[in-house]
């Protein structure tokens, strides 16, 4: 329940009157405002707008607003020696070239600073050679060419098609596997909609349309030059080449008009089924090299594009709290875009704007939350999240003590088909809870609530009658927050419908067509599910400032740990030989999960009953909630990824984008049966499981009695 | 209203330049490739160049290859054919012609063409 002791407003007002004071129009208002022109990180329009809502929150009544600054490596294509791709005949002449920019979107021609499509962070050069088909580029798509196809990449230019797994991984795995570049592009079986038409006349991807993003293995390191601490003024720097995360081959992305003149050339062998091939008219031959005719031409790549140290701003607004003002829930979402940013990130953007407005509002008539509120604007998300880290190093030693959440406001629609949230476990019944009282704004589902459309459209794959949450992954700004803190975290936003739209993303994302017009034509002409999602995420964020006991359910950790551990355990089990040879036993890690479970239940007991007038009670029950979260924490973080800490969830190594349960011993176990040394190999699984063990047991530990 | 306007033309000699100017008007010329087509007295019409949207590819029929350069200037909306080297056989109309789709790599179907504009070369 809601409550606070600091104003005469009861309970159930405060919260109705927060979400009541929300609307859609200003949700769109802002919107609008924010997307008339590009604010990529590292520019004076961005820093505009951070001035813009630092002054704007002022006025909506944060108790005070302040730009936070840091100096990290962001990455610029060359203004006077364009990026771009060539085919190229056997002497060296450009016989086609890939476009320098997209067609700009209808009202949009005049508008400068628009960055031509790259891949943020390619070093330079121009490489030549034979191309080479490699799918999604994900590990599975190498294993096949690798051993299966026994097709070699090494000195050869590989094209990937966008989707499926973040597109660092792509390079990643292409660099591994000896590629001297590597071309990405957007095929249109992933970003093109059957039955709807392009930008401008719907929400497709048109064929000169291309999807910008940067190409790091960062692994939660912010800044590539400062791994650990604030890039502030007087930060000590790598060099260049100890940087963390850069690739080191070239990188440049395409639409698919352009991806269709160099692979309808492709040669040599066919692709290996069905599932590598696209909705191009074109073979998908897989290569090396062009067919017959075509045999003696090559491709080249182009790229300039230098990596510069650039001031960055992170906008914090602060919110007081009247009664635990040393404890801090956060609101963050980005600001920078990488054009007009019309979904990513300003659709998000937008909806904080309407949030702050309306706590403010609040404020404004005495009232004030429990626990203080951070309002976060951060800056070069689009760069590897670097805005929110440097910031969360900066004061790390703050947040580890009083975190209590972090809700995350990037983007807040990917589709408008129904409601999609990731989360702590800790943070399930309060979503679950929240969504009851929220009214659904689906068509067919007028009168009822949220909870109900979302679990009709998006129904648990365990438990009937429930909707589904997923496991939080990375690729957004709660990464520093969840992964490398352990404090508790959760996102929410509308998505599409995954079993009828399987392209990947939304079409338009990161592209020039990602406008105020997309949004408002083609995916909420109503901003009805903005308002929602502003809802969702206004109404956690109110909850968990406010409640009196943190709205956290440790019963519901127990309960994925026992189904992450079944999971593991069946991995592993497909190795029953090695298993018996090497004494692989997962007794400790299930009876840490036991005990898990039954302390969990008997703190739930205690938690209802104790005396919540009493201050210092209250106070050791809320702190046992909010570090719990910590106690998933290795401080010595997961193999080779000292920044990904949380024992329990990491991003997959093979997908930034997805969450990873067990992390430490899945990595362990993957592709165990292709190591040299099984002995070793099957040491680092018992290791893992130990270690996994371990930590599950303190954290058990840490829900007990104290005395 | 959509429409695309030649200038340029003139009688010229043999072995002399001439540059075509194409000025569009009612859409964005930046967003579409763009052609020259001719048609000598008494002949169809003939393909002649092929300019992509942003510049970056630029194609040219055998028959004026090496001497004629299409051009753009997307700021001023105009596209541009310097004609070097004009021979006899390039007397006809020019017409300027927009390509159909937007941001396309390669010549495609032309669906807007200026009203042309005369080159005769004679000496």
């Known amino acids: 329940k809601s409550s606070n002791e600091a104003t005469n407003i009861t309970p159930k007002h405060n919260m109705k009157a927060f979400l009541d004071e929300l609307k859609a129009e200003n949700i769109k208002k802002f919107l609008y405002n924010f997307t008339q022109i590009p604010h990529l990180a590292g520019t004076e329009q961005n820093f505009q707008l951070a001035k813009q809502i630092q002054s704007q929150w002022k006025e909506f009544g944060l108790d005070s607003v302040e730009l936070a600054h840091y100096d990290v490596l962001l990455s610029y294509p060359n203004k006077t020696h364009p990026n771009y791709i060539s085919i190229i005949n056997e002497d060296g002449n450009e016989i086609f070239n890939t476009s320098l920019f997209e067609p700009p979107p209808p009202g949009y021609e005049n508008v400068s600073d628009i960055v031509p499509p790259f891949s943020a962070f390619s070093p330079q050069g121009m490489p030549e050679g034979d191309l080479v088909y490699v799918n999604y580029a994900r590990t599975e798509d190498f294993f096949k060419l690798e051993r299966d196809m026994k097709i070699n990449c090494s000195g050869k230019i590989v094209i990937a098609r966008y989707g499926k797994v973040f597109r660092g991984n792509k390079v990643k795995n292409a660099q591994l596997a000896g590629a001297k570049g590597v071309i990405l592009y957007s095929d249109p079986a992933d970003y093109f909609a059957p039955g709807v038409k392009s930008y401008p006349d719907g929400w497709n991807l048109p064929g000169g349309g291309v999807q910008r993003g940067n190409i790091l293995n960062l692994n939660g390191a912010g800044d590539p030059l400062t791994p650990g601490y604030p890039a502030n003024e007087y930060a000590y720097r790598r060099g260049i080449a100890e940087a963390v995360g850069l690739p080191s081959i070239p990188v440049h992305p395409i639409g698919y008009y352009d991806a269709q003149k160099l692979l309808e050339k492709m040669g040599g062998s066919a692709p290996p089924d069905s599932s590598w091939r696209g909705s191009l008219k074109v073979p998908y031959n897989v290569g090396p090299g062009f067919t017959g005719n075509f045999s003696t031409q090559k491709v080249k790549m182009h790229i300039h594009s230098t990596n510069e140290v650039t001031r960055i701003y992170n906008v914090i607004g602060t919110l007081r709290g009247a009664v635990e003002p040393d404890r801090y829930v956060i609101l963050g979402g980005h600001r920078d875009s990488w054009v007009f940013g019309g979904i990513d990130p300003q659709s998000g953007a937008a909806v904080v704007h309407e949030i702050v407005r309306s706590f403010g509002t609040l404020k404004k008539e005495g009232w004030r939350p429990r626990r203080t509120i951070l309002f976060a604007s951060w800056d070069a998300e689009e760069f590897g999240l670097l805005g929110s880290t440097e910031w969360a190093e900066e004061n790390s030693r703050l947040l580890q003590e009083r975190g209590v959440a972090y809700i995350n406001a990037d983007s807040s629609i990917e589709g408008n088909y129904t409601l999609r949230v990731d989360c702590t476990p800790l943070m399930y019944s309060l979503v679950h809870n929240l969504t009851k009282e929220l009214k659904s704004p689906d068509e067919g589902f007028e009168g009822k609530s949220l909870y109900e459309s979302w679990t009709k459209k998006s129904p648990s794959p365990e438990f009937s009658g429930m909707p589904r949450i997923s496991k939080l992954g990375s690729g957004n700004d709660f990464e520093v927050f969840f992964q490398r803190l352990g404090i508790a975290s959760g996102r929410a936003r509308y998505t599409k419908n995954w079993e009828t739209n399987k392209f990947s993303g939304y079409p338009l994302y990161h592209s020039v067509y990602e406008t105020y017009e997309l949004v408002e034509k083609f995916y909420d002409p109503m901003f009805k599910y903005h308002l929602t999602v502003a809802q969702v995420r206004g109404g956690m964020v109110f909850e968990l400032a406010n409640s009196i006991v943190l709205p956290f359910d440790c019963r519901d950790y127990a309960v994925v740990l026992r189904k992450y551990a079944d999971k593991i355990y069946s991995i592993s089990m497909k190795h029953p030989q090695e298993m018996k040879t090497y004494s692989v036993s997962f007794d400790s890690l299930f009876s840490a999960v036991k005990n898990f479970t039954e302390i969990a239940s008997k703190f739930s007991e205690r938690l209802q009953d104790f005396d919540k007038s009493n201050p210092i009670v209250l106070r050791m029950m809320n702190d046992q909630l909010m570090f719990l979260e910590r106690a998933f924490i290795d401080p010595l973080g997961l193999p080779d990824r000292p920044f990904y800490r949380h024992v329990i969830y990491a991003p997959s190594s093979h997908n930034k984008y997805a969450g990873e349960s067990f992390p430490g011993i899945y990595d362990a176990l993957f592709d165990i049966e292709s190591k040299v040394d099984p002995s070793k190999a099957w040491g680092e699984v018992k290791r893992q499981i130990y270690v996994a063990a371990f930590t599950v047991q303190a954290a058990a530990e840490t829900l007990s009695e104290v005395a | 209203e959509v429409q695309l306007v030649e200038s340029g033309g003139g009688v010229v000699q043999p072995g002399r330049s001439l540059r075509l100017s194409c000025a569009a008007s009612?859409?964005?010329?930046?967003?579409?490739?763009m052609n020259w087509v001719r048609q000598a007295p008494g002949k169809g019409l003939e393909w002649v160049a092929f300019?992509?949207?942003?510049?970056?590819?630029?194609y040219y029929a055998d028959s004026v290859k090496g001497r004629f350069t299409i051009s753009r200037d997307n700021s001023k909306n105009t596209l541009y054919l310097q004609m070097n080297s004009l021979r006899a056989e390039d007397t006809a109309v020019y017409y300027c012609a927009k390509d159909r789709i937007v941001g396309a790599r390669v010549p495609d179907a032309f669906d807007i063409w200026g009203q042309g504009t005369m080159v005769t070369v004679s000496s």
């Open positions: 300019i992509s949207y942003d510049g970056s590819n630029r």
């Open positions: 009612g859409f964005p010329l930046i967003s579409y490739g």
